[in-house]
């Protein structure tokens, strides 16, 4: 008799793929543009990335450090009107892209939450949640919550408002903290909160360290849904050298939870390569004309246009991973088992019932390594086969689709492999 199928978990839209943050409309659009109408014209690009949600803004009126002149219900006219916003919402909906609005109040000021009048600000947020939910927004983000006194209780209240409207609505909180205990205390009182933090931001050193961070986090958070990013707002290049970007893309897309990226992560956008550009929001490189300040500073392979035409580019890798993440059951909601693969390596399996299974092997080191996959670490339900097909490598030169013997697996420096193998009873 065939074994019974495992019951599928309830999946919310943010469980099904990546979120894409556009914190600075002007930097994202470039060329002196930077409004909601212009963003609407970029939705096809977001569709091509297969992202499930757009985390937008903040775009509300905020006079720096002035509570009275901060209005979370009014769109800053520099970004457009309510009509523009509504039009963006409708267009995004047609393309199955959800819109999450950042309501971090004092985004132009020193302290994101103002240093005084906490209750006044919290009431403004409550009003804004209700207003924008009724206007059709799919969720909200609030950042820098380490600056918000009694953050846990406010987040619980805002979560109740968000979920009270519809279980299909999302609240994301962001913190600069990388401390697991602080992160857990924020999560404790907020069941469905998605939290972005700097927890993984110092993980770039070794595979063992990354494995330790990831497994500690997953063990500590139990069954709850996680999000994966390196910070609450900044680009991957703020934390990682260029040679690790592909590795991290592969990891973020294949860990159990929602991957969260900032605009430009998909092309390796790096403020340091663009003199005069702010670290937190450099101009998006659509093509070589996007950064006219210094002629020749931008080459084609740094841009969306150039990378779109190159199947071996970071952007092409991002699109492939995003596509896999959104359609494979084992990556959507599969179980996760990390196991030993040797020093410098981080490896894990994703599997769901009788669906195709995935093996991820990541070499964080700058030397080539042979992987000694310790299958004995794995439960019987997640055993390794002798061979697995190579779905993709982060490095060029491997023949995709070819079966690889897992006992003889060798990885290049900074290489990540995504392998697939069938369920075997």
């Amino acid at each position: 008799r065939a074994p019974r199928c495992r019951e599928l978990p309830a999946q919310k839209w943010w469980h099904t793929g990546a979120l894409y943050r556009i914190g600075d409309l002007q930097a994202f659009q470039g060329h002196g543009a930077g409004n909601l109408a212009g963003l609407k014209g970029r939705l096809d690009y977001l569709s091509s990335l297969k992202v499930k949600g757009l985390v937008l803004g903040p775009i509300h009126k905020n006079q720096k450090d002035d509570v009275a002149q901060t209005d979370l219900l009014q769109i800053d006219p520099n970004f457009g009107s309510k009509e523009d916003f509504d039009s963006l919402l409708q267009s995004a909906k047609k393309k199955s892209i959800r819109v999450i609005l950042d309501l971090t109040p004092n985004y132009r000021g020193e302290n994101s939450w103002f240093s005084t009048q906490v209750d006044t600000v919290a009431t403004k947020v409550k009003d804004a949640l209700e207003f924008w939910l009724q206007a059709g927004v799919d969720g909200f983000q609030v950042r820098d919550i380490e600056n918000l006194k009694d953050a846990s209780s406010f987040l619980a209240e805002w979560q109740n408002i968000t979920k009270g409207f519809s279980e299909d609505r999302l609240l994301i909180a962001g913190t600069n903290s990388s401390d697991l205990q602080q992160i857990l205390s924020l999560l404790e009182s907020n069941k469905d909160l998605l939290l972005t933090s700097s927890y993984l931001s110092d993980s770039g050193s070794t595979g063992e360290h990354t494995k330790s961070l990831v497994t500690q986090y997953l063990n500590a958070t139990g069954n709850r849904w996680c999000s994966w990013s390196l910070s609450q707002a900044r680009l991957l290049t703020s934390f990682l050298p260029a040679q690790l970007l592909r590795l991290y893309q592969l990891m973020l897309f294949t860990l159990p939870g929602t991957p969260v990226f900032s605009y430009g992560d998909e092309i390796g956008l790096d403020a340091a390569a663009l003199p005069g550009q702010p670290m937190e929001a450099p101009v998006m490189l659509w093509d070589e004309s996007s950064f006219p300040d210094i002629p020749g500073a931008v080459s084609a392979n740094m841009t969306v246009k150039g990378q779109s035409e190159d199947p071996g580019s970071l952007l092409s890798l991002f699109r492939r991973l995003s596509d896999q993440r959104s359609k494979e059951r084992s990556l959507l909601h599969g179980d996760f088992h990390a196991f030993s693969a040797g020093p410098g390596l981080f490896s894990y399996i994703r599997h769901w019932d009788q669906n195709e299974r995935f093996l991820v092997v990541l070499n964080f080191g700058d030397v080539g390594l042979s992987a000694g996959l310790q299958a004995s670490d794995l439960p019987a339900s997640a055993s390794l086969p002798a061979k697995a097909d190579l779905l993709l490598s982060t490095q060029p030169g491997r023949e995709e689709g070819s079966p690889l013997e897992l006992e003889r697996l060798k990885l290049e420096p900074h290489e990540g492999l995504l392998l697939r193998f069938p369920y075997a009873a």
Epitope: A68, L73, Q74, K82, T123, K124, V125, E130, G136, I161
Partner: antibody
Framework: QVQLQESGPGLVKPSETLSLTCTVS????????VHWIRQPPGKGLEWLGL???????NYNSALMSRVTISKDTSKNQVSLKLSSVTAADTAVYYC?????????????WGQGTLVTVSS | DIVMTQSPDSLAVSLGERATINCKSS????????????LTWYQQKPGQPPKLLIY???TRESGVPDRFSGSGSGTDFTLTISSLQAEDVAVYYC??????????FGQGTKVEIK
């Protein structure tokens, strides 16, 4: 119990500014929003604006350049100012509480105050 | 702005009989986010302020007699008084309660006793 009471001059000259106050009791202005609505004699209702618990304001765009809503939470008062009035602004003016989460419905209303614009 | 149109303008119904008031909006008032319909009904008796009867198209406000019911979705709505009482003589208004301001009212329907 919840109460709202409008007050202000019953007669205003054309081109002047109409000023009304809504005094509330039985609830806090830091927890509920307050709408202003008007009704010309023998006619229907027209929504003017809403001031939220946190102080944000939505206005009827048809009157936006002339209407100002504010509040003094410590006095439990919401005020409405309408500038450059004409005879067409003659109406009973009501304040009403925004009573439900995820709805702009008005669950409690003041008795209304008649304002006549005439020289 | 959303335009609300009520019909009929006035209605005469015998005591104990059913009264039906219609309201049409110029665009759908269904919020796909929570599947609620953002339409509100008020009753205004002579010399009094309006009174909230129904919100979300069919949710009766507490204290409102169950002879009042609201129905409809999208753009077409109905307020029904199942058995008209003398105290129900009033003008009834529908209001768009949807999304962005202004939250406009219908022109009103006057209900009298035949």
């Amino acid at each position: 119990q919840v109460q709202l009471q409008e007050s202000g001059p019953g007669l205003v000259k054309p081109s002047e500014t109409l000023s009304l106050t809504c005094t509330v009791s039985g609830f806090s202005l830091t927890s509920y929003g307050v709408h202003w609505i008007r009704q010309p004699p023998g006619k229907g209702l027209e929504w003017l604006g809403l001031i939220w618990a946190g102080g944000s304001i939505n206005y009827n765009s048809a009157l936006m350049s002339r209407v100002t809503i504010s509040k003094d939470t410590s006095k439990n008062q919401v005020s409405l100012k309408l500038s450059s009035v004409t005879a067409a602004d003659t109406a009973v003016y009501y304040c009403a509480r925004k009573g439900h989460m995820y709805s702009y419905a008005m669950d409690y209303w003041g008795q209304g105050t008649l304002v006549t614009v005439s020289s | 702005d959303i335009v609300m149109t009520q019909s009929p303008d006035s209605l005469a119904v015998s005591l104990g009989e059913r009264a039906t008031i219609n309201c049409k909006s110029s665009q759908s008032l269904l919020n796909s986010g929570n599947q609620k319909t953002y339409l509100t009904w008020y009753q205004q008796k002579p010399g009094q302020p309006p009174k909230l009867l129904i919100y979300w198209a069919s949710t009766r406000e507490s204290g409102v007699p169950d002879r009042f019911s609201g129905s409809g979705s999208g753009t077409d709505f109905t307020l029904t008084i199942s058995s008209l009482q003398a105290e129900d003589v009033a003008v009834y208004y529908c209001q768009n309660d949807y999304s962005y301001p202004p939250w406009t009212f219908g022109q009103g329907t006057k209900v009298e006793i035949k």
